[in-house]
Interface confidence: medium
């Protein structure tokens, strides 16, 4: 896992190699300058987009070589005891449902990318966060309602999935489902008044100042 120094370094993508090269070049040219990561990412992204297939080729070769290295090293790598069990994720297990904010992002990310093709991933995420914060609670409702329904479905699915796996796990699943319903009631956030008490937002949804659910 995180702490195993013997674990092979993860494989790098062609774009990651390109960014690494950019960084090295920048360091050579400006050894003492501190890097504005957001600006730097933006510039790299813009440059990558304008590069020809031929120019990108060298980085793709580097990525291919690194992939081969990673696969080779992983064949001989023995993870520490207990890690394999912990790390295993059943591909048949129900997927965690997306939050309202995530659903909102899925809808608006392509629009932002279309309007601002040069924006880095970080800047797109920042813009999405700002947009969500400035969205009135009534406009958030379709995402919240869909997220609530997906969450409900997930809780049923995960309880059924656990029941199939272990007889006593079903009970755990039901308890967990009830608990998360209670959590939802305790965190009825963003719906009505802006209040003196600070609201706790669910998961990765950004905090928002709003006045009601209408």
């Amino acid at each position: 896992g995180k702490g195993d120094p013997k674990k092979p370094r993860g494989k790098m993508s062609s774009y990651a190699f390109f960014v690494q090269t950019c960084r090295e070049e920048h360091k050579k040219k400006h050894p003492d300058a501190s890097v504005n990561f957001s600006e730097f990412s933006k510039k790299c992204s813009e440059r990558w987009k304008t590069m020809s297939a031929k120019e990108k080729g060298k980085f793709e070769d580097m990525a291919k070589a690194d992939k081969a290295r990673y696969e080779r090293e992983m064949k001989t790598y023995i993870p520490p005891k207990g890690e394999t069990k912990k790390k295993f994720k059943d591909p048949n297990a129900p997927k965690r449902p997306p939050s309202a904010f995530f659903l909102f992002c899925s809808e608006y990310r392509p629009k932002i990318k279309g309007e601002h093709p040069g924006l880095s991933i970080g800047d797109v995420a920042k813009k999405l966060g700002e947009m969500w914060n400035n969205t009135a609670a009534d406009d958030k409702q379709p995402y919240e309602k869909k997220a609530a329904k997906l969450k409900e479905k997930y809780e049923k699915d995960i309880a059924a999935y656990r029941a199939k796996g272990k007889p006593d796990a079903a009970k755990k699943g039901v308890v967990k489902a009830e608990k998360s319903k209670k959590k939802k009631e305790e965190e009825e956030d963003e719906e009505d008044e802006e209040d003196e008490e600070e609201e706790e937002d669910e998961e990765d949804e950004e905090e928002e100042e709003d006045d009601d659910d209408e």
Epitope: A136, D138, D139, Q141, P142, K145, K146, E185, E186, E187, E188, D189, E190, E191, D192, E193, E194, D195, E196, E197, E199, E209, D210, D211, D212, D213, E214
Partner: antibody
């Protein structure tokens, strides 16, 4: 306890103006959006106007039937919300309710649920 | 955008009655239900499709499926006689929408 008290209703002639008021107490007024809802005699409820809070630039919204004639405003320092009604028509005759969102048991809940007792506005020649 | 409710419904004491509310946006929007008694006082009985505010009898329940929201009152009492309005938000107007209201009569 939360209270919303409307005042200023009465009998006016068509094309005249009237301003109704709503005094709020018992909750943090500056943090709540405020609404006016009306009910014509023997008819259903109709949303008239909404005003949001300072962080939301006091944004206002109106029902199509009153757009351009009615103006909602608020005074956070006095916990008051107003509805200025100009160029009144006979079809504006109704009981006007001042309403606000509410919090239940420390949980933010949904739906407008503080209602005043209403004030009657009659437009007739 | 409209929310359609039946104008009237009737029930005998002790029985269950359901009032429906239909609207194209209801799959995406929450439904809220209000009770207006003959004295004109207004109380919210259901919010967010199926949540019941504190102080509201558990005889009142709400559900929503597709374009229809439903308010159900079981073991109906004489004091439940009132007008019931559904409401939903609608982002284009930035103002909510009310249904036309359903007059519930408790017979007997």
């Amino acid at each position: 306890a939360v209270q919303l008290v409307e005042s200023g209703g009465g009998l006016v002639q068509p094309k005249e103006s009237l301003k109704i008021s709503c005094a709020a107490s018992g909750f943090t007024f500056s943090n709540a959006a405020m609404y006016w809802v009306r009910q014509a005699p023997g008819k259903g409820l109709e949303w008239v106007a909404r005003i949001r809070t300072k962080p939301n630039n006091y944004a206002t919204y109106y029902a199509d039937s009153v757009k351009g004639r009615f103006t909602i405003s608020r005074d956070d320092s006095k916990s008051m919300v107003y509805l200025q009604m100009d160029n009144l028509k006979t079809e504006d005759t109704a009981m006007y309710y001042c309403t606000a969102p509410r919090r239940t048991e420390g949980i933010v809940s949904s739906g407008v649920d503080y209602w005043g007792q209403g004030v009657m506005v009659t437009v007739s020649s | 955008y409209e929310l359609i409710q039946p104008p009237s419904a009737s029930v005998t004491p002790g029985n269950t009655v359901s009032i429906t509310c239909s609207g194209d946006e209801l799959p995406k929007r929450y439904a809220y239900w209000y009770q207006q008694k003959p004295d004109k006082s207004i109380v919210r009985v259901i919010y967010k499709d199926s949540e019941r505010p504190s102080g509201i009898s558990d005889r009142f329940s709400g559900s929503s499926s597709g374009t229809t929201a439903t308010l159900t009152i079981r073991d109906t009492q004489a004091e439940d006689e009132a007008d019931y309005y559904c409401h939903s938000t609608y982002s284009d107007d930035k103002l909510p929408v009310f249904g036309g209201g359903t007059k519930l009569t408790v017979l007997g």
